[in-house]
Interface confidence: low
Amino acid sequence: MASTGLELLGMTLAVLGWLGTLVSCALPLWKVTAFIGNSIVVAQVVWEGLWMSCVVQSTGQMQCKVYDSLLALPQDLQAARALCVIALLLALLGLLVAITGAQCTTCVEDEGAKARIVLTAGVILLLAGILVLIPVCWTAHAIIQDFYNPLVAEALKRELGASLYLGWAAAALLMLGGGLLCCTCPPPQVERPRGPRLGYSIPSRSGASGLDKRDYV
């Protein structure tokens, strides 16, 4: 039961991470205009994302503009877009693989195969989490670097947007979920002889493995 619980928790966290990644990548809140310094001349807030930028006027009116040409976009933005899309697809694949090998599904009967499938799913989700982290950390690094760079016009200094924080949380959830799925896979054991008197099959991953629960912690 313990490993089933871990599986469910891992998958739940991964689903939340996937949703967080989706929202983070879609929202135009990666960079927010920083109202600091003394060269801000426009009474508005600028939100920038991977796909569009939005201007919120002091009146509350918001106008969003999708970036025109893919070729005219900075390479780091194109890379961030690509990594986000790949991470989302990879996380989705990881979840599908996890469901296939989950204890509570009958897609695969063989316990050993199930364990390997869940381990694979965990690794995929860990990788997806890392892929989310890369553009989020890169963007944050660029913002912080510009923020303290005296050469950057004060008017163009940005603050870390909500999408970055959400991205960090989503990456953490994906990696935590993936890590938990990896942990549900038991260490290889020496197969015990099946005594005719005992009448039980080879211990499965569902908790009766002969290992104390504390060994999983």
């Epitope: 060269s39 801000i40 001349v41 009474a43 503009k65 050469l151 950057v152 016009a153």
Partner: antibody
Framework: EVQLVESGGGLVQPGGSLKLSCAAS????????MSWVRQTADRGLELVAS????????YYPDSMKGRFTISRDNAKNTLYLQLSSLQPEDTALYYC?????????????WGQGTSLTVSS | QIVLTQSPAIMSASLGERVTMTCTAS???????LHWYQQKPGSSPKLWIY???TLASGVPARFSGSGSGTSYSLTISSMEAEDAATYYC?????????FGGGTKLEIK
């Protein structure tokens, strides 16, 4: 219709002072950032100073700091540029420009300019 | 400071001809911080293209802008008499904001 009309230019001796004005109409002046930009035949266009909508923040490129002061009177819909310790190289056509309605600090509207000549 | 170099400084084109002028920055500029202005003799500059490729209000569709990093360009698909003017690029990516030296476009 947005209109910006500069005034106050003229002939000034080196070391002298002058105050340029820019009267704005056709838009809500108090909601928009403004700039002064100057133009000469040899140096082209140069940003002189910027000010935010309420006058609380100003910006001067390093080359302009100290001798120029930008200010505004939102009640009178007027932008000002105080020039002091004028030098012959300050001879230029001075424009006021408005950051009206787009995102990235482009100057949407410009006045017709006022000419300043610094000469003895 | 970022130096914007426009080329050619002067160019002439026949009516109906395709025209391209370039603006090269001394270091990388965000495409969202690069703008173009048009100025005719005796008049003040007018915002023509902002954020690299967005045409300002009233600008004919024959104009277009593109570029990224250090290289930007303004293109007129079919030159018309009213397009004869000087075009300036402008960046507000790094302090101080700077303008290019201009490209004067004449009718051949």
């Amino acid at each position: 219709e947005v209109q910006l009309v500069e005034s106050g230019g003229g002939l000034v001796q080196p070391g002298g002072s002058l105050k340029l004005s820019c009267a704005a109409s056709g838009f809500t002046f108090s909601s928009h950032g403004m700039s002064w930009v100057r133009q000469t035949a040899d140096r082209g266009l140069e940003l002189v100073a910027s000010i935010n909508s309420n006058g609380g923040r100003t910006y001067y490129p390093d080359s302009m700091k100290g001798r120029f002061t930008i200010s505004r009177d939102n009640a009178k819909n007027t932008l000002y540029l105080q020039l002091s310790s004028l030098q012959p190289e300050d001879t230029a056509l001075y424009y006021c420009a408005c950051y009206y309605d787009n995102t990235y600090y482009a100057m949407d509207y410009w006045g017709q300019g006022t000419s300043l000549t610094v000469s003895s | 400071q970022i130096v914007l170099t426009q080329s050619p400084a002067i160019m002439s084109a026949s009516l109906g001809e395709r025209v391209t002028m370039t603006c090269t920055a001394s270091s990388s500029v965000s495409s969202s911080s690069l703008h173009w202005y048009q100025q005719k003799p005796g008049s003040s500059p007018k915002l023509w293209i902002y954020t690299t490729s967005t045409l300002a209000s009233g600008v004919p569709a024959r104009f277009s802008g593109s570029g990224s990093g250090t290289s930007y360009s303004l293109t007129i698909s079919s030159m018309e008499a009213e397009d004869a003017a000087t075009y300036y690029c402008h960046q507000y990516h790094r302090s101080p904001p700077t303008f290019g030296g201009g490209t004067k476009l004449e009718i051949k």
